[in-house]
């Protein structure tokens, strides 16, 4: 039970996380016009990943696109693949995790496949997450280099003008989203390795060891109690076909990675 | 019809103070800002004083900075320039003017109304 | 504080002439965000109060002929009237509406021959 709300959780908090990140990375405000201390400009200038845009005292907003590849710096560009990276990911971790959901039963998939699947997405989540906070931060610390800077913009050359006007950037909104998303993220990747510990298949302490046709080689698991035949063959005259619907003797344990942990 | 008409102006003594009202029709007073704008006379214009549609952001020419007083009353689509400490050099025609949607433009000017500061 | 400086500060004309109009400001006032212009022009006629013209440095305000027009960048900025007409005579102004304070230029006065 506990395992199952460990997984549970550990999807939804990552679900929140990844949507948090898609949110900061579509978000125009990475970074916001310096109002402290500064020429009071009519425009309010804020910028994020993709466009920069432009608030009037009407309250009229234009924004306008980076029509541009190879004029962008460098920097603003790693900060985009990371959190593409970390959105493509997070996207593919969440598919994943959705079938290894103990609480969602498809076919017959045994418990050491949605372990692995677990921790695959688990780990996805992981990596996700320390690519939003990676990108977030790399776009912060470029805030703090251009901020004392006596441009007028963080992205010299990139409007093809320099204004003489100091506009200086502050951290927008979309840091502190990106940030607390990435450690959403990153929190319920944990959560699914963790999880995942406890779904591999358990040793079950049983009453009688399970007698197998003679024949065949038995193989008990160090320290438990649970036998397996060496072929994985079925050895009662059941239907292999029972919809899933086997006792917990009959489904066969194959080592896997999980085993002995 | 967007229609602003001035009032309030006249004859002051130099220290002396006065308030000058703009009454408004024919647009959402609460959701444009506000300009105080003013002409010596035979001289050019001369910005005076901004307040915003929900009077969070207000500003002031260096000139009257500390003496003038913007406000406004949204329920009575009304606009204020109190002004105190009068000096001669505020001689004027001052017009009240919305601030347009677009561009930061000063849109609409209502048609002024005469404000002498003279002993 | 933003210096608005228009040149000349009067012409005459012949009907039906081109004219140009200048203003230079002391600092930019193109905003990158939107790659605008933040100025404007304003034509005041005798006896009367300011109209708006042009805004965005190059957008004609509605209503306002097509003659005029508005050009520039940066700190140099131009208004042009195609083919002036009489009751263009009138006093015009370029206004900065980037940085407060909102500063005014001091004025060119149109007038015919």
């Known amino acids: 039970m506990a395992v199952t709300a460990c997984q549970g959780l550990g999807f939804v908090v990552s679900l929140i996380g990844i949507a948090g990140i898609i949110a900061a990375t579509c978000m125009d405000q990475w970074s916001t016009q310096d109002l402290y201390n500064n020429p009071v400009t009519a425009v309010f200038n804020y910028q994020g990943l993709w466009r920069s845009c432009v608030r009037e005292s009407s309250g009229f907003t234009e924004c306008r696109g980076y029509f541009t590849l190879l004029g962008l710096p460098a920097m603003l560009q790693a900060v985009r693949a990371l959190m593409i990276v970390g959105i493509v990911l997070g996207a593919i971790g969440l598919l994943v995790s959705i079938f290894a959901l103990k609480c969602i039963r498809i076919g017959s998939m045994e418990d050491s496949a949605k372990a692995n699947m677990t921790l695959t997405s688990g780990i996805m989540f992981i990596v996700s997450g320390l690519c939003a906070i990676a990108g977030v931060s790399v776009f912060a610390n470029m805030l703090v280099t251009n901020f004392w800077m006596s441009t007028a913009n963080m992205y010299t050359g990139m409007g093809g003008m320099v204004q003489t006007v100091q506009t200086r950037y502050t951290f927008g909104a979309a840091l502190f989203v990106g940030w607390v998303a990435g450690g959403l993220t990153l929190i319920g990747g944990v959560m699914m390795c963790i999880a995942c510990r406890g779904l591999a298949p358990e040793e079950t302490n049983y009453k009688a060891v399970s007698y197998h046709a003679s024949g065949h080689s038995v193989a008990y698991k160090p320290g438990g109690f649970k036998a397996s035949t060496g072929f994985g063959s079925n050895t009662k005259n059941k239907k292999i076909y029972d919809g899933g619907a086997r006792t917990e003797d009959e489904v066969q344990s194959y080592p896997s990675k999980h085993d002995y942990v | 019809e967007v229609q602003l008409v001035e009032s309030g102006g006249g004859l002051v003594q130099p220290g002396g103070s006065l308030r000058l009202s703009c009454a408004v029709s024919g647009f959402t007073f609460s959701s444009f800002g506000m300009h105080w704008v003013r002409q010596a006379p035979g001289k050019g214009l001369e910005w005076v004083a901004y307040?915003?549609?929900?009077?969070?952001?207000?500003y002031y020419a260096d000139s009257v900075k500390g003496r003038f007083t913007v406000s406004r009353d949204n329920a009575k689509n009304s606009l204020y320039l109190q002004m105190n400490s009068l000096r001669a050099e505020d001689t004027a025609v001052y017009y009240c003017?919305?601030?347009?949607?677009?561009?930061?433009?000063?849109?609409?000017w209502g048609q002024g109304t005469l404000v002498t500061v003279s002993s | 504080d933003i210096v608005m400086t228009q040149s000349p500060d009067s012409l005459a004309v012949s009907l039906g002439e081109r004219v140009t109009m200048n203003c230079k400001s002391s600092?930019?006032?193109?905003?990158?965000?939107?790659?605008?212009?933040?100025l404007t022009w304003y034509q005041q006629k005798p006896g009367q109060p300011p109209k708006l013209l042009i805004y965005w440095a190059s957008t004609r305000e509605s209503g306002v002929p097509d003659r005029f027009s508005g050009s520039g960048s940066g700190t140099d900025f131009t208004l042009t009237i195609s083919s002036v007409q009489a009751e263009d005579v009138a006093v015009y102004y370029c206004q900065n509406v980037y940085i407060y304070p909102l500063t005014f230029g001091q004025g060119t006065k149109l007038e015919i021959k």
């Open positions: 003017v919305r601030s347009g949607y677009y561009g930061n433009s000063l849109d609409y």
């Open positions: 600092q930019s006032l193109f905003s990158s965000g939107n790659q605008r212009n933040y």
């Open positions: 307040i915003s549609s929900g009077t969070t952001n207000i």
